[in-house]
C-alpha cells in the first residue's frame, strides 16, 4: 500500500553466515542502525555466529564480535553456538540481547547445550552474559591427592605411573576438575596447588616430575589435615566438591590424631578415597589387618565405594579405572541419568524483553519438552518440570514439544502482563500457552490454544498486537508456517482477539494463492502504524514464496482488530535480484530516515532490506453545487 518497493536499501552480508536471519531496528541518541544476526558467522576457526551493526542510510556493516565473548570458569564450546539466532531489543534503554542457543560447555564426558545470551548496551558494547540455565558441572571438583612418600614406598615409579594414569582420567579444566598434590612422610609439602594447572596435559607433566621425598615416619593424619586446611584453601573454589585421595603403604605414626582429622574433614564435606598399598606388608610377611582398618577409617563411608587395597605398588595401575569411575559416580548421585533437566535446554532459542527482565525460550529443557526461563536483575526464575504438567501431561513427555520455540507477552486490563510461549511440536499439532510465572518456580497457565494439523508447527511464531496503542493487547497472532494445504507447505496465521481476559479465535489471515511452498507465518511482526491511520499494523513473512525468494504481507490494524486481507504484498523479486528467504525476519518500530514515517527492516538469506514508508495522502472529496 504505502511501502516503497522501488528504492529499498539492500544491505549485503554473508549468505553462508545467514546474515539477515534476524533483524532489529536500533536507535542510539538519534542515530539509526540495523542490528542483524548472522548465526552461522565464523570467528577464527569456529562457526560461532555473530551480530552486525549496519548504518541505515549508507556505509558498511560492522561485526560486533560477540562470538569472542567468553565465560570464565567453564570449558566452553562455541562452535555452532548460533549467536544471533534470536535478538530482543529493550526499547527502554535501547540495549539488546543476542542469544546463542547452542552454546555448550564441557561437563565430564558430555557437552551440555545450555545456551547463553549476551546483553549489549545502547552503544553496542557487550555488558553482560545471561545464562540462566548454566549450572555447575557435576565435575566441579577440587581433588587433592595425598601421597605417602616415605622410605617404605618402593618403587616410586609405580606410584608416579598410577598418579599420571589417574590424572588422565580427570576432566581438568575451567568449571570442572582442579587437582592438587601433597606428599607426606615426616613432613608435608605441596607438590602443586589446585589452581596451578588448567589442563590434563599440564598436570600430567607436573606429576611426572614429582620425586619421592622419603622419611622414616608416615604421618598420614598430618598429611590429611594439611590437605584439608591448606591444600583445599590454596586455589580451592567456593562450591566445588572436595575430594581427597590418600595413598599410603603403612600404619600412620600419628594415628591418634586421625579421629580429629577425619571429623574436621567430615565437617568440611571432604569425600575421602583411601588406597592401601600392601607391598611393604607382603614383602615382610606382616599381617596388615591393623593397617587396613586404619585405611578404612580414613576412607569415607561406605567403604566399598571409597576404600581400595592393592597387593603392591605395581598393582596400583589395576585400580585406576575403578577409582576414576567411583569419583565420577559422584556426578549424579541422586539423579536419574537418562533424564535431562536444563543440561540441553538451548536457552535463548527465543527471547523477549519484559519490564523486569527477559524471557528466554529453552526448547531443549526437560527432555526437549521445553520451558521458558526468566532472568531479572533480582535473579532467575526457572519453573520446575512439574509446573507445565497441566498442559504438557506426563504421557506425552517423550514427544519433544519444544515449548519456548517462541516467547512473547500480552497485557490484559484484568491480569496485567501475561507471558505467551509456543510449543510447535506438542502432540504433533502444536500448542500455545498463556501463563504467569512465580518466584517459587511454579506457573499459572491461564489459557492454551492447540493447533489443528499434524506437523503444521502451530506456535512456532507468536506476536501480540496492541492495535490502538492503549497499552492493552488486542490481538494475538499465532503462526503455523508448515500448515499443509492444497499440496503445499502454505502456512497459516491464526487470529485471536482479547475478550474479557481470554483470547478468542477469530479466523486467519489471508495469503496469496500461489501453488508453491510459502511458509506464510514464519515470521510475524507487530509494527507501528505504517499507513498513518493511528492503528498499529502487522507484517507477515512467507520466506519460501516465489521459489524461495520470499515475500511479506502487510495487514492493517483497524478498531481493535486486524484486517484479514493484506493491504500490500511485497515480493523479493520486486526489490532486487537474487534475494532469497526474504521475510525470514521482520522488525518495524522506528522511523529510520527522519521523515516521520515508520520504516520496515526485513531479513533475507545474506541480506537485510530496509523498506521506506511513503506518506499517505488522504483526499476527502466533497461536491457542492452553485447555485444550490
Amino acid at each position: 500500500f504505502n511501502m516503497d518497493t522501488r528504492k529499498p536499501r539492500v544491505i549485503p552480508g554473508s549468505r553462508t553466515a545467514f546474515f539477515g536471519y534476524t533483524v532489529q531496528q536500533h536507535d542510539i541518541s538519534g542515530n539509526k542502525w540495523l542490528v542483524v544476526g548472522a548465526p552461522l558467522e565464523t570467528n577464527g576457526y569456529q562457526k560461532t555466529g555473530d551480530v552486525y551493526k549496519c548504518p541505515v542510510i549508507h556505509g558498511n556493516c560492522t561485526k560486533l564480535n560477540l562470538g569472542r565473548v567468553t565465560l570464565s570458569n567453564v570449558s566452553e564450546r562455541k562452535d555452532n553456538m548460533r549467536l544471533g539466532l534470536s535478538l530482543a531489543t529493550n526499547p527502554k534503554d535501547n540495549s539488546f540481547l543476542a542469544c546463542s542457543p547452542l552454546w555448550s560447555h564441557e561437563c565430564g564426558s558430555s557437552y551440555y547445550t545450555t545456551g547463553m545470551c549476551s546483553r549489549v548496551n545502547s552503544n553496542f558494547r557487550f555488558s553482560k552474559t545471561v545464562a540462566p540455565a548454566l549450572q555447575r558441572c557435576q565435575t566441579y571438583m577440587d581433588i587433592v591427592i595425598v601421597l605417602d612418600g616415605s622410605n617404605s614406598i618402593y618403587p616410586w615409579v609405580e606410584v608416579q605411573h598410577f598418579l599420571i594414569n589417574i590424572l588422565k582420567k580427570f576432566y581438568i579444566g575451567p568449571g570442572q576438575i582442579q587437582v592438587g598434590v601433597v606428599q607426606y612422610g615426616e613432613d608435608v609439602v605441596h607438590e602443586f596447588h589446585l589452581n596451578d594447572y588448567r589442563s590434563v596435559k599440564d598436570v600430567v607433566e607436573a606429576a611426572s616430575h614429582i620425586e619421592q621425598r622419603g622419611g622414616t615416619e608416615t604421618r598420614t593424619a598430618f598429611g590429611i589435615e594439611f590437605a584439608r586446611s591448606e591444600a583445599f584453601q590454596k586455589g580451592g573454589r567456593k562450591g566445588a566438591k572436595k575430594v581427597m585421595i590418600v595413598i599410603t603403604d603403612g600404619e600412620s605414626h600419628d594415628s591418634p590424631d586421625l579421629e580429629k582429622v577425619i571429623q574436621q574433614s567430615e565437617r568440611d564435606n571432604v569425600t575421602r578415597y583411601a588406597v592401601a598399598v600392601l607391598g611393604y606388608y607382603n614383602r615382610r610377611g606382616i599381617n596388615p589387618e591393623t593397617f587396613l582398618n586404619e585405611i578404612k577409617y580414613i576412607a569415607s563411608d561406605p567403604d566399598d565405594k571409597h576404600f581400595f587395597n592393592v597387593t603392591d605398588e605395581a598393582a596400583l595401575k589395576d585400580i585406576v579405572d575403578a577409582l576414576g569411575d567411583r569419583i565420577f559416580s559422584l556426578e549424579g548421585t541422586n539423579k536419574n541419568e537418562t533424564s535431562f533437566g536444563l543440561e540441553m535446554s538451548q536457552t535463548g532459542f527465543s527471547s523477549h524483553v519484559v519490564e523486569d527482565g527477559v524471557l528466554l525460550g529453552a526448547v531443549g529443557a526437560y527432555d526437549w519438552n521445553g520451558a521458558v526461563l526468566k532472568e531479572t536483575s533480582a535473579g532467575k526464575v526457572i519453573p520446575l518440570r512439574e509446573s507445565y504438567l497441566k498442559e504438557f501431561p506426563e504421557e506425552l513427555k517423550n514427544h519433544g514439544a519444544y515449548l519456548g520455540y517462541t516467547v512473547t507477552s500480552v497485557v490484559s486490563s484484568r491480569q496485567g502482563r501475561v507471558y505467551v510461549a509456543g510449543a510447535p511440536r506438542f502432540n504433533h499439532t502444536g500448542k500455545v500457552i498463556l501463563f504467569t510465572m512465580h518466584n517459587n518456580r511454579s506457573l499459572t497457565i491461564h489459557q492454551a490454544m492447540r493447533g489443528q494439523q499434524i506437523g503444521s508447527y502451530f506456535g512456532s511464531e507468536i506476536t501480540s498486537v496492541d492495535i490502538d496503542g492503549d497499552g492493552v493487547t488486542d490481538v494475538l497472532l499465532v503462526g503455523a508456517p508448515m500448515y499443509f494445504n492444497e499440496g503445499r507447505e502454505r502456512g497459516k496465521v491464526y487470529v485471536y482477539e482479547l475478550r474479557q481476559n481470554l483470547f478468542v479465535y477469530n479466523g486467519t489471515l489471508k495469503d496469496s494463492h500461489s501453488y508453491q511452498n510459502a511458509r506464510f507465518g514464519s515470521s510475524i511482526a507487530s509494527v507501528r502504524d505504517l499507513n498513518q491511520d493511528s492503528y498499529n499494523d502487522v507484517v507477515v513473512g512467507a520466506p519460501l514464496e516465489d521459489n524461495h525468494a520470499g515475500a511479506i504481507y502487510i495487514f492493517h490494524g483497524f478498531r481493535g482488530s486486524i484486517l484479514k486481507t493484506p493491504k500490500q504484498r511485497i515480493t523479493a523479486s520486486e526489490l532486487a535480484t537474487g534475494l532469497q528467504y526474504f521475510g525470514c525476519s521482520i522488525h518495524g518500530q522506528l522511523d529510520l530516515n527522519e521523515d516521520g514515517l515508520i520504516d520496515l527492516a526485513v531479513g533475507a538469506l545474506g541480506n537485510a532490506v530496509i523498506l521506506w514508508s511513503r506518506p499517505v495522502v488522504q483526499i476527502n472529496a466533497s461536491l457542492h453545487f452553485e447555485p444550490s
Partner: antibody, heavy 120, light 109 residues
Framework: EVQLVESGGGLVQPGGSLRLSCAAS????????IHWVRQAPGKGLEWVAS????????YYADSVKGRFTISADTSKNTAYLQMNSLRAEDTAVYYC?????????????WGQGTLVTVSS | DIQMTQSPSSLSASVGDRVTITCRAS??????VAWYQQKPGKAPKLLIY???SLYSGVPSRFSGSRSGTDFTLTISSLQPEDFATYYC???????????FGQGTKVEIK
Amino acid sequence: EVQLVESGGGLVQPGGSLRLSCAASGFNLYSSYIHWVRQAPGKGLEWVASISSYSSYTYYADSVKGRFTISADTSKNTAYLQMNSLRAEDTAVYYCARYWYHSAWALDYWGQGTLVTVSS
Amino acid sequence: DIQMTQSPSSLSASVGDRVTITCRASQSVSSAVAWYQQKPGKAPKLLIYSASSLYSGVPSRFSGSRSGTDFTLTISSLQPEDFATYYCQQSAPYSSLITFGQGTKVEIK
C-alpha cells in the same frame, strides 16, 4: 637414654592453680604423644590428658575438662599441665608418660611422678 | 566411652603359681591393650602391648592374650619380684583417649 622428669607439684589451696612440667630427654617430643596420668593416694591409675606435640591436638578426661590445659614446647622438649580451679579430689601423684607408634600406642616410659596436694 | 573391667581386684598366690588376670572391654575394641606393673611408690612399667606382645626387657613368664572383648595377663610362674599391682589399659582407636582398669593387687599367700 629415654627419661621423663616431672616437676611443679606441691601444696595448693582449693580453687588455686599449679603448673606441672614434664622434661623429656633421650627422644624428640616432636614425634610422640605425652599423657598425664594421676594416682590418688591408695587408688588406681586415672588418665588425665594427652597431647600430640606435632599437631597440638589435645584430649582430656571429663573430670578435668575446662580446668586443666595440656601443652608442649618442642623447642624445650617439655610438656606442661596447667591446673586451675583445683579441688581436693585432684590430690594425687601426677605422672607423665610417652605414648607412640613404636610401642603400639602403649605408655612405654613414665616419669617418677610429682605429688599435688589440694588442701586448705 | 569404653570401660575396662578388671578382675579380680586382688588375689593371693604363692611363688611358682600360675596367675591369670582378666580385663573385659565394655564394647568391641582394637588390640591396642597394654598391661602395666606398679610397685608401691614407683611409676608403672609396661609389660605387654598390642594385647599379646612382650615389651623388651620383660621376662617371658609374662604373656598376654585376647578372646573377643576379654584380655588376659598370665604370669606362668609367679616370682617374688612379681608381687605388685597390675593394670590393663585400652587405647581408643584413632584418638589418644585411654582408659585404665581398676587394677589387680597380687599379694603373697
